[in-house]
């Protein structure tokens, strides 16, 4: 709904009245809206809500909301949806992180190593070799080294000492019983406080091929986000009448994968600098989609003197 009410706290912007040439000071419109009519000598500016697919993050004096970034390419998920106040933000699915502008699985720490630092959507797991008194018998991207089973606390003895890869094996002393019943199990050595830990380089254990471009990729360096869809259209192959069944068929891996090229199968391939899509603010967003429309159209959009 158009909104005319001016708040005492709202900022102002300067506008040149085309009819009179007069420079007027108008109240800005709130975030999520834009100026549909500038103020005049006799009237307040009029604000309207951003249409679907557009947004303004701040109070502003602009005449058109910013286009949201393109949909997140498969298999990325929407960290933030496109809404009147926010641009769309994309992130890697769980168990993965952004690496070389694509999603890679978190490193699997091998047996004998444990997680030193958990992985996030932007950082890989960090592994460390299990310290004395601890072990890891499972390759995992989430598990820390576990302390050896304390055999003594179970009135048992260590039959086979643990290693970096195996737990202590506990059993009864032969003098108490004629047979031993080994039972693996949490630590007989105290964990040393000042032991050196060895970090495994993450790349060592990333599954091979995660950063390769063997999937018929025509791009050797992957873009930050790639949407291979028609410019200005929304991909939707629900209707064969629209003739777009093959458009955007291969979004995963964030790379171009052998599309049939033709005048109606153009691809948008854009590298986004960290500042470009955020109006001069540094973005914490892992990934944003490219903007809709012709690349030149958007160059001025995110730093508008009337928006700041």
């Amino acid at each position: 709904q158009p909104e005319q009410k001016a708040s005492n706290l709202i900022g102002t912007y300067r506008h040149v009245d085309r009819a009179t040439g007069q420079v007027l000071t108008c109240d800005k419109c709130p975030a999520g809206t834009y100026v549909s009519e500038h103020c005049t000598n006799t009237s307040l500016r009029v604000c309207s809500s951003c249409p679907v697919g557009t947004f303004t993050r701040h109070e502003n004096g602009i005449e058109k909301c910013h286009d949201c970034s393109q949909p997140c390419p498969w298999p990325m998920i929407e960290k933030l949806p496109c809404a009147a106040l926010t641009d769309r933000e994309c992130t890697c699915p769980p168990g993965m992180f952004q690496s070389n502008a694509t999603c890679a699985p978190h490193t699997v720490c091998p047996v004998g190593w444990g997680v030193r630092k958990k992985g996030t959507e932007t950082e890989d797991v960090r592994c460390k070799q299990c310290a004395r008194g601890t072990f890891s018998d499972v390759p995992s991207s989430v598990m820390k080294c576990k302390a050896y089973t304390d055999c003594l606390s179970q009135n048992l003895v260590v039959i086979k000492p643990g290693t970096k890869e195996t737990d202590n094996v506990c059993g009864t002393l032969p003098s108490f019983s004629s047979s031993t019943s080994p039972s693996p199990g949490t630590a007989i050595f105290p964990r040393p406080e000042h032991m050196e830990t060895h970090e495994v380089p993450s790349s060592t254990y990333v599954p091979k091929g995660m950063n390769s471009t063997e999937s018929n990729s025509s791009a050797s360096v992957r873009p930050k986000v790639l949407s291979s869809i028609q410019e200005g259209t929304v991909p939707d192959n629900t209707s064969s009448a629209r003739g777009k069944e093959d458009v955007n068929k291969t979004l995963p891996n964030l790379q171009v994968v052998n599309h049939q090229q033709g005048p109606h199968h153009r691809h948008i391939l854009k590298l986004l600098p960290s500042m470009e899509a955020t109006g001069g603010e540094k973005s914490s967003t892992p990934i944003k989609g490219p903007k809709r429309g012709h690349p030149r159209q958007n160059l001025h959009k995110h730093f508008d003197i009337n928006e700041h």
């Epitope: 998920i77 949806p81 471009t213």
Partner: antibody, heavy 118, light 107 residues
Amino acid sequence: EVQLLESGGGLVQPGGSLRLSCAASGFTFSPYWMSWVRQAPGKGLEWVSVIYPSGGHTYYADSVKGRFTISRDNSKNTLYLQMNSLRAEDTAVYYCARPGFGAAFDYWGPGTLVTVSS
Amino acid sequence: DIQMTQSPSSVSASVGDRVTITCRASQGISSWLAWYQQKPGKAPKLLIYAASSLQSGVPSRFSGSGSGTDFTLTISSLQPEDFATYYCQQANSFPLTFGGGTKVEIK
């Protein structure tokens, strides 16, 4: 605990229609792509369709294109599959699944059986 | 479309055996491959994602390897509860496609 629960399956005549629903709980539904996968009796798994987190962008297997429509209501945490012009070969258990870890289907519903027969 | 060819289609094995199932993609899919286990009347269960990452809660006797076009699922020491059908699936491009399945039966 993540849960997906399909409903709406049943017996339908060839050429008929059916609408499947999948109620999601235990996770934030709206950021995720969601999918339908089916399995004909005694056969393997076949991917049917997937929908973008905020809807609008949809992809289909060739075998169902033009007949099935996937949709979602993020306010209700529900995924839908509208099936029209049903054929005998559409008879299957239909699973709702979430592409999560590594884009693999990390959560599945128990499935709902759709039987197309006269 | 990317075809996924799984082999063998069935394997007879005993408890304690090492079982290897292979999956070949008709074109490179990097590491966008998952393995599932399915038991009769149940929904599939994710075992391995991204070719070699073990899904949380899955026993460490399951492991995956490979990238590009050739992938392997290995069960290092078969347990009674592992008798089931196993499927590979590529998540690289639409349409997403599954292998034909490998039934692991009791010898």
